[in-house]
């Protein structure tokens, strides 16, 4: 397995522990969602990553101004996404780069599922079923 | 002891079986146990479900219903060492879409 596909709960520095919640969010399009990470904030800064599929490598999340916001209050870091869209679907990870070792640690990830009908075809199919 | 990443969620239709893997790198006879956390509720302690079945520690839930929803977490322990825990997989139970009223075979239609 690739190194990014495995993790352990290390007994090393406090930086090596990062807890993420929730594991899964399903919300309708247009709603606001929040995901949280708890870590030793003194150990290093937190950034957010995103990947669309389970088997992909996570990429740095490009924060959309006015719609996506990251905040941190001591040990608690929060990512807020407003007006969620279908293209927001995927798994979000918080990541901390340790100040002293420059090692990188990730949370377990939060999967976001945006509910509703994403295409005209899906909507038509639903109407056909209703008819 | 390494735990490999597991899917964040698994969608299973009502009445089907759910299979959860617990991939880890232990070559010894590791003890694999399964636990369930009610999503968003953070009950303590998590509900103990039992041991894993095969060498991979698989958990199978047969005939899934809505009450089975939640986060399924496996713990792997070698000897007296502290356990390692998977990130957990959220089980989503899907109600199959209702069959349309006019969903009949071609033979029936032509009668």
């Amino acid at each position: 397995a690739r190194s990014e596909d495995r993790y352990r709960n290390p007994k090393g520095s406090a930086c090596s522990r990062i807890w993420q919640s929730p594991r899964f969010i399903a919300r309708k399009r247009g709603f606001t969602v929040k995901m949280h990470c708890y870590m030793n904030s003194a150990s290093g800064n937190v950034s957010w990553l995103w990947k669309q599929e389970m088997d992909e490598n996570p990429q740095q999340l490009k924060l959309e101004k006015g719609r996506m916001e990251e905040s941190q209050n001591e040990s608690l870091a929060t990512l807020t996404i407003q007006g969620i869209r279908f293209e927001d679907n995927g798994i979000y990870f918080c990541q901390q780069k340790c100040n002293n070792t420059s090692e990188v640690y990730q949370g377990c990830g939060t999967e976001l599922r945006v509910m509703g009908f994403s295409t005209l075809a899906q909507l038509k199919q639903r109407n056909t079923l209703k008819d | 002891l390494w735990m490999h990443k597991v899917p964040a969620s698994l969608m299973v239709s009502l009445g089907e079986d759910a299979h959860f893997q617990c991939p880890h790198n232990s070559s010894n006879n590791a003890n694999v146990t399964w636990w369930r956390v009610l999503h968003g509720n953070y009950t303590w302690p998590p509900e103990f479900l039992g041991p894993g079945e095969d060498p991979n520690g698989t958990l199978i839930i047969q005939n899934v219903n809505k009450s089975h929803g939640g986060i399924y977490v496996c713990r792997v322990q070698e000897g007296n060492e502290s356990y390692q825990q998977s990130c957990g997989t959220y089980l989503r139970v899907r109600q199959p879409p209702p069959r349309p009223f006019l969903d009949m075979g071609e033979g029936t239609k032509n009668r």
């Epitope: 709960n9 522990r17 807890w19 919640s21 929730p22 929040k34 949280h36 708890y38 209050n73 001591e74 040990s75 608690l76 929060t78 | 956390v37 968003g40 509720n41 953070y42 009950t43 303590w44 302690p45 998590p46 977490v73 825990q85």
Partner: nanobody
């Protein structure tokens, strides 16, 4: 809102022990993280130890092997057993809890002084 109250602080000699407790004013909602932070004079507040809803723990390097965090579901939400105390452990210790929705609550703090 959940009101938190710490207790158990005091003056102790180097090498001694103390046990801190954190109680809630009302029955608290389900909690994701329960933690202890501390703030020494002239320094920033820092994480000491935390425990989550899975029972996993995290400790600051400086207290590993000396401090033990534990949780309870009754009125006492979280405790911190501090052994082999050192003068550098002198600080105000704060209880901190986080709900699954990310609401964060803090106690008023309890003073711990390690001095001979």
């Amino acid at each position: 809102d959940v009101q938190l109250q710490e207790s158990g602080g005091g003056l102790v000699q180097p090498g001694g022990s103390l046990s801190l407790s954190c109680a809630a004013s009302m029955s608290s909602p389900s909690l994701w993280v329960r933690a202890w932070h501390r703030q020494a004079p002239g320094k920033q507040r820092e994480l000491v130890a935390a425990i989550n809803s899975d029972g996993q723990t995290m400790y600051a390097d400086s207290v590993k092997g000396r401090f033990t965090i534990s949780r309870d579901n009754a009125k006492t939400l979280v405790s911190l057993q501090m052994d082999s105390l050192k003068p550098e452990d002198t600080a105000v210790y704060y209880c901190n809890v986080v709900t699954p929705r990310g609401q964060q609550y803090w106690g008023q703090g309890t003073q711990v002084t390690v001095s001979s």
